[in-house]
């Protein structure tokens, strides 16, 4: 049986059940290389409290559909008096990056995971030439996830003192320049994740090969190498390589630019101080507030919730968007879709789409940007579920009793963007994490 998601095959992936202190290793096409789980384990569970290993999915006992992968075992389990077998179930959804498998829950018999990934899309519009896993768990099983830094088009400019060259990078995947026909970036060779431009020439100095690594707490490393044989004439016989070290800052701060810290014989070392390198619980909340010692800040957007069936309305030219954030109030237009953001076509108000659901909510504060994300909306033709990204700005003089109002700013590939100036986005900082 052919592997269902070939892009995911090259790596062993990790997921964590934080509540029970369990680390899962997943290899969806072969077996994980862990002796204690046996030679054919596709999903290996490591219980860190009891220091035991169990195979909870066998690569030989795999069954697959387009959106579900199940690995059975021969191990019996007791579920409500019936004799079942232990199994793992991975539900796949379309995403814009390779993404990460997320542990959902486990019963006596079944270990459930969910994975939003380009590999599950109906169309190839989000697929990279080359992409590697962009997250890692540290020794305390805390997740560090750089997926939000991945650019689907364009690149980051590396701060370099050399006026004659420009070094462009992407994070964990190659640079897509197709949407910018006029700039220097256009000359970058396909597949490159680190592109050096000198004059009118552009050179591939690195492609992603291995996934993100953690070198020590709050320091993550990504390495790019030039795969192609043949040396560049300005590299003194060496093969180019790029090492990007992502550093979690010791306290809250605005984002910084990736900086070139060393360069010799086409070996480029880049340091990027960014809060995205911090563990995810420091940056994100599933509620509408971020507070407490762990986050170093106090943010509470819950006063923006609308009561009594009313919604915020944002005009999107062809569409009207109805928003009801930070609550579970149904938007009247949205046909019981549990939508936090509802898109209604002006010319045909029967055309209604959920552009993100209120139980699929993430509040993120990172590098000085406060963002509320609603995902899991109605599917687009690519298979991607509509989502909304609301970028908040602090405005102490916002109208509507300080609440302000969301403004639709654009749509790209079924992601809807809004900005929202409000006094409730004014962040109160504590110190040190």
């Amino acid at each position: 049986q052919a592997a269902p998601f070939p892009e995911l095959c090259s790596y062993t992936w990790e997921a964590v059940d934080t509540k029970n202190n369990v680390l899962y290793k997943i290899n969806i096409c072969g077996s994980v290389d862990i002796v204690q789980c046996g030679p054919s384990s596709a999903v290996c569970m490591h219980d860190l409290d009891t220091r035991t290993y169990h195979s909870v999915g066998d690569s030989v006992l795999r069954s697959a559909t387009r959106s579900l992968l199940e690995f059975n075992t021969t191990v019996s389990c007791d579920q409500q008096g019936t004799n079942h077998r232990v199994q793992s179930s991975i539900a796949f959804l379309c995403g814009k990056t390779l993404g990460t498998p997320e542990f959902v829950t486990a019963t006596e018999c079944v270990h459930y995971f969910e994975w939003r990934t380009t590999a599950a899309c109906k169309k190839d519009i989000f697929k990279a030439n080359k992409e590697v896993p962009c997250y890692v768990f540290d020794e305390e099983l805390r997740k560090h996830d750089l997926n939000p830094l991945i650019k689907l088009s364009g690149a980051y400019l590396v701060d370099d003192s050399d006026p004659d060259t420009s070094l462009f990078i992407n994070v964990c995947r190659d640079i897509d320049t197709l949407r910018d026909p006029g700039s220097q970036l256009r000359a970058c060779p396909p597949g490159t994740a680190a592109c050096l431009v000198r004059g009118h020439q552009a050179f591939d100095v690195g492609q992603p090969r291995d996934g993100l690594k953690v070198v020590r707490k709050d320091r993550l490393v990504l390495s790019y190498v030039r795969e192609e044989a043949g040396k560049l004439d300005f590299c003194d016989g060496h093969s180019p390589a790029v090492t990007i070290t992502f550093v979690c800052p010791s306290e809250r701060r605005e984002g910084t630019i990736p900086k070139l810290t060393a360069k010799s014989n086409c070996r480029y070392e880049i340091e990027w101080i960014t809060e995205y390198a911090c563990h995810r619980d420091y940056l994100e909340s599933k509620t509408c507030s971020l507070s407490g010692e762990q986050q170093d800040v106090s943010i509470d957007l819950t006063p923006l919730a609308q009561s009594g069936g009313s919604s915020y309305i944002s005009d999107g030219k062809e569409y009207l968007f109805y928003l009801n954030v930070c609550g579970e109030t149904e938007i009247q237009f949205c046909n019981k879709k549990q939508a936090a953001v509802c898109q209604v076509k002006k010319s045909d108000t029967s055309q209604v789409k959920a552009a993100g659901r209120y139980h699929n909510q993430t509040l993120r504060y990172s590098d000085g940007d406060l963002t509320l994300i609603y995902f899991g909306g109605d599917e687009c033709s690519s298979g991607f579920q509509r989502m909304s990204v609301i970028n908040f700005e602090c405005n102490k003089t916002a109208g509507n009793d300080g609440k302000g109002t969301p403004v639709f700013t654009g749509e790209v590939d079924c992601t809807y963007f809004f900005t929202w100036d409000t006094e409730y986005a004014c962040v109160h900082h504590h110190h040190h994490h």
Epitope: G154, Y156, L157, S166, T177, D180, S183, D369, T409, E411
Partner: nanobody, 123 residues
């Protein structure tokens, strides 16, 4: 690709003010960085100010800091350059540009450009 159209240039006395506008059309969210540049006769095109579309993060050339302010109105897909305390050396053609490169002020990294609007500051 995005199309850009500037307006608001003109003749003004030293110490006066002008507000330039730049309206963007096309798939504006595929660009992340919006900039104003200027070019005086016989000189290279130089960076003036930049703003990111998804947030209010801004950067300025040292020569205009404290006098010029870049802003945006997402609802109108428009960016602005408010120019106060104008000096004769601010005389130039001002261009609006868009880039898919983050953290750049280099004009060669901007792939989309407007036609420019003339600003003349008399003493």
């Amino acid at each position: 690709q995005v199309q850009l159209q500037e307006s608001g240039g003109g003749l003004v006395q030293a110490g006066g003010s002008l507000r330039l506008s730049c309206e963007a059309s096309g798939r504006t969210f595929n660009t992340y960085n919006w900039g104003w540049f200027r070019q005086a006769p016989g000189k290279e095109r130089e960076f003036v100010a930049a703003i990111r579309w998804s947030s209010s993060k801004t950067s300025y050339a040292d020569s205009v800091k404290g006098r010029f302010t870049i802003s945006r109105d997402n609802a109108k897909n428009t960016i602005y350059l408010q120019m106060n305390s104008l000096k004769p050396e601010d005389t130039a053609v001002y261009y609006c540009a868009a880039s898919i490169v983050d953290f750049t002020t280099n004009p060669s990294h901007f792939g989309s450009w407007g036609q420019g609007t003339q600003v003349t500051v008399s003493s």
